[in-house]
Amino acid sequence: ILGRSETQECLFFNANWEKDRTNQTGVEPCYGDKDKRRHCFATWKNISGSIEIVKQGCWLDDINCYDRTDCVEKKDSPEVYFCCCEGNMCNEKFSYFPEMEVTQPTSNPVTPKPPYYN
């Protein structure tokens, strides 16, 4: 039986690396307590259709990230997009699939917005 996916390292990026005095890009090892889970995350902005990555790296134990193998943002048009996932370097690729609000069906089906991939 396959166990849950362990996150041991994530892609790291910080657009504000100079101001924050961190590395700009690389691979971040995710250490932690044995009873805590670690995740990878990505945050980005959509500036007039252009994707601008803000941050990527390791994310602390968060139930909202449990058992997510893919990094997917599901909120509809946030100002800052966020996704998290479990598994080594799972934040290398991220996407946006907004969850459709459940409403009364209409005669015109709604086409989901296309995802964005890094």
């Epitope: 005095r21 602390l60 909202n64």
Partner: antibody
Framework: QVQLVQSGAEVKKPGASVKVSCKAS????????MAWVRQAPGQGLEWMGI????????SYAQKFQGRVTMTRDTSTSTVYMELSSLRSEDTAVYYC?????????????WGQGTTVTVSS | DIQMTQSPSSVSASVGDRVTITCRAS??????LAWYQQKPGKAPKLLIY???SLQSGVPSRFSGSGSGTDFTLTISSLQPEDFATYYC?????????FGGGTKVEIK
Amino acid sequence: QVQLVQSGAEVKKPGASVKVSCKASGYTFTSYNMAWVRQAPGQGLEWMGIIRPSVGSTSYAQKFQGRVTMTRDTSTSTVYMELSSLRSEDTAVYYCARVSMYAPEPMDVWGQGTTVTVSS
Amino acid sequence: DIQMTQSPSSVSASVGDRVTITCRASQGISRWLAWYQQKPGKAPKLLIYAASSLQSGVPSRFSGSGSGTDFTLTISSLQPEDFATYYCQQAFSHPWTFGGGTKVEIK
């Protein structure tokens, strides 16, 4: 257990400098960052900056740029915050706080605070 | 700098009451939000990180929600030890900033 122990209260004259220490124990010193936060009497919390003990790099709030210096001594697991050109508005309790190296970087352990009084 | 606005600035409540505190960021901060509790003469204590994750050892009556610009801290059933001041704080970009605080007082 994880602990941050800060140096004792200080009384300083305007124009002087103060150096507050924060000694860490109970965890691997270089595996966490350290922030400094201050609180003026009856006021809210104000973030001053952060130091990354593993490499010694610092990032300061613009408000304190040029007046604050954060350093660390890995041999004693101690971080220091020095504030110069003190004025009466710097009278506050100064806290060090351990910061996770990983996002979203919460401050999970705090020192007991050091009261700094600036008075002529 | 990102401004954090907390409301209300104070609230009077009784033991057993449900208390809700809100925090609004001047721009989107995704889930880079923490909540702290501070009692007079003491250092702040971390309650919630990542907007909704409960810090180890914190009672489950505390919960957080929200994302983007609007966040909420809820105490489901106020206990005598919960009378304190609560602060929200963003760590999305430097300088990290705090809300002005919400004092929870005994009615």
